[in-house]
Interface confidence: low
């Protein structure tokens, strides 16, 4: 019998134990300051910096600022420890300085929209610019009192780093105020102005009737033809043409705080829910291996994804590279970065029926117009951190 | 060619548990949603509980909630119905069925509640 | 949970005749319907799905037509190999359900 331990799995020091309840078969006992399954990655160092109710603490974006907390369940704040804001128009109302609040329903549950005055035009009617709010733009935390489009969305930080979500939408169409409000604004109804959110299409929802159906075979590798349109996520591109090779296709790599006791059933959520909010089939990756490609961050392998630069001081045998990790990690919450396959054969110009996000680019600007006005975080199963859109390659010529 | 083996049925006494198991062939099993599908004697067909491809997902008809556990195995092609607390109203042919249009059948295996 | 309820329960026909059962659903369930076909002593056969999306195999003179709430299994000519019993069943939303059946029977 092969003896797991055996190819010492076990990086920076850490014992590995053969035991059969482990899907690897093995599990490593790490030393301080790294984790992971095979204690490939470095824990991020919190210090006195602790994150409650099962938030993540992460490394900061920004060399020397603190670490941040991504916090779970609706808590926010730098510890977590701000309770979730109520569904809806609360009370308290989540509208500042005197706007008034009207209740929406969407695929999250009840939300809300702000009618704000002009002095204080954010999405929850902040003041750009606001006292308290400067040196807090681009710490990777989003402030929701310093987030609007004069401010940039808090330097980015409350739209997934992307400084302005509806640049080259006319500002005067305030196109950003109306994004997702579930009425269509035919102004902001073009690529520029990111669709309306996609306010004005019809039918805005897969019909009761399909949804289950199309929830059960969402990419599962046979087109369900029912399933097949933009509504319905597009089967999780099921359908999509077979020319060309779809592991060299446009993909995301997302940065996701995940729960890994039910990391799979958290995976579909998040590729259903994202195909049916941009709609554009979304899928989990697979590398050559079969694997899916899901992995621990922080990590080496997981800021490659994300198109990061290698912290050089940082060592790792070569093999954790070549594999997808972290599936197993035995913590409540855990960041990874998880790569989607995006069919995009439906959009574009010569799909005018169909209107969606033709590039990874858009479909990025997409989201974070999505997350500066507060429509994101209720649809996911764990806070999205950033996103990296890659545009797709060739696949390399054969070497004979 | 498709195939599914069910197997595991037989005479049991009320309150008393029995697994049932669906061996299948011809397919990539891990691929597709499973189901299974009972038939009292005379009667019509039931959904007693189904599950999704990698297991993540289950539903289970009301009538039995909290006495059976579906399960599946997809490194050995099998699926499993562990029922508990049986009741002479399980009684029945139980079928395993692919998917939600049940394209494939098993040949069913009975099961008999019966003091 | 949505009924699926058949007519008639059981009828006679002669061979050649032109055989309609219908089901009618609760509430909408779309086009996700699928229709069963079950000979004495054997195993379910699935014959039409998505409504009216034949199943590989089945005999073009088995046809399915509606959506919503009302639909219909269609044998344009019927043949003393379709004595059977035919079921209709949703899957637009749990539990899946199955009409209580329709035994057709050769005059």
């Known amino acids: 019998e092969i003896d797991p331990c055996h190819s010492q799995p076990c990086f920076h020091g850490g014992t590995c134990e053969a035991t059969a309840g482990s899907p690897l078969g093995f599990i490593c006992h790490c030393p301080k300051g790294f984790e992971g399954p095979t204690c490939s990655h470095r824990a991020p160092s919190c210090g006195f910096h602790h994150c409650h109710h099962g938030g993540l603490c992460l490394p900061s974006p920004k060399p020397g600022f603190p670490p941040r907390c991504a916090c779970l369940s609706g808590y926010g704040g730098p510890d977590c420890l701000t309770p979730p804001a109520p569904k809806g128009c609360g009370p308290p109302s989540p509208c500042l300085y005197n706007g008034s609040c009207s209740e929406t329903t969407g695929l999250g549950g009840p939300g809300f929209r702000c009618s704000c005055p002009h002095s204080s035009p954010g999405p929850r009617c902040q003041k750009p610019g606001a006292k308290g709010c400067e040196g807090r733009s681009g710490d990777g935390a989003c402030d929701a009192g310093c987030s609007g489009p004069g401010g940039n969305w808090d330097g980015g930080d409350c739209s997934l780093g992307v400084p302005d979500p509806w640049k080259g939408c006319p500002s005067h169409s305030r196109c950003w105020l109306l994004f997702r409000d579930g009425q269509c604004h035919p102004q902001c109804d073009s690529e520029e102005c990111l669709f309306d959110g996609y306010d004005c299409e019809t039918p805005p929802a897969c019909t009761p009737a399909y949804d289950q159906y199309c929830h059960d075979h969402f990419h599962n590798g046979h087109c369900e033809k029912g399933c097949n349109t933009a509504e319905c996520g597009w089967d999780g591109g099921d359908c999509r043409p077979e020319d060309g090779d779809p592991e060299w296709g446009p993909s995301l790599a997302l940065l996701v705080v995940l729960s890994p006791p039910a990391l799979d059933q958290q995976l579909f959520a998040l590729a259903r829910v994202l195909s049916l909010t941009l709609r554009v089939g979304l899928w989990v990756r697979k590398d050559r291996d079969g694997r899916d490609m899901v992995y621990p961050y922080p990590g080496a392998r997981a800021e490659e994804k994300l198109g990061g630069t290698r912290d050089p001081t940082y060592q790792e045998r070569a093999a954790p590279q070549t594999q997808p990790l972290g599936k197993e990690t035995d913590s409540l919450s855990a960041g990874f970065v998880v790569v989607m396959g995006v069919d995009l054969s439906r959009c574009g110009p010569d799909h005018p029926a169909s209107r969606c996000p033709w590039d990874p680019g858009l479909l990025l600007r997409f989201l974070a117009a999505m997350a500066a006005v507060g429509a994101l975080e209720p649809l996911l199963p764990g806070p999205l951190l950033a996103v990296h859109p890659h545009a797709g390659t060739a696949p390399p010529a054969n070497q004979l | 060619e498709v195939q599914l083996v069910e197997s595991g049925g037989g005479l049991v006494q009320p309150g008393g548990s029995l697994r049932l198991s669906c061996a299948a062939s011809?397919?990539?099993?891990?691929?597709?949603?499973m189901s299974w599908v009972r038939q009292a004697p005379g009667k019509g067909l039931e959904l007693v509980s189904t599950?999704?491809?990698?297991?993540?997902?289950?539903y289970y008809a009301n009538s039995v909630k909290g006495r059976f556990t579906i399960s599946r195995d997809n490194s050995k092609n099998t699926l499993y119905l562990q029922m508990g607390s049986l009741r002479a109203e399980d009684m029945a042919v139980y079928y395993c069925?692919?998917?939600?249009?049940?394209?494939?059948w098993g040949q069913g295996t009975l099961v008999t509640v019966s003091s | 949970d949505i009924q699926m309820t058949q007519s008639p329960s059981s009828l006679s026909a002669s061979v050649g005749d032109r055989v309609t059962i219908t089901c009618k659903a609760s509430q909408d369930v779309g086009t996700a319907v699928a229709w069963y076909q079950q000979k004495p002593g054997k195993v379910p056969k699935l014959l039409i799905y998505w409504a009216s999306t034949r199943h590989t195999g089945v005999p073009s003179r088995f046809s399915g037509s509606g959506s919503g709430t009302d639909f219909t299994l269609t044998i344009s000519s019927l043949q003393p190999e379709d004595v059977a019993t035919y079921y209709c069943?949703?899957?637009?939303?749990?539990?899946?359900?199955f009409g209580q059946g329709t035994k057709v029977e050769i005059k």
């Open positions: 069943q949703q899957y637009s939303s749990y539990p899946w359900t």
């Open positions: 011809g397919f990539t099993f891990s691929s597709y949603g």
């Open positions: 599950i999704n491809s990698n297991g993540g997902r289950t």
């Open positions: 069925a692919r998917d939600q249009g049940f394209a494939y």
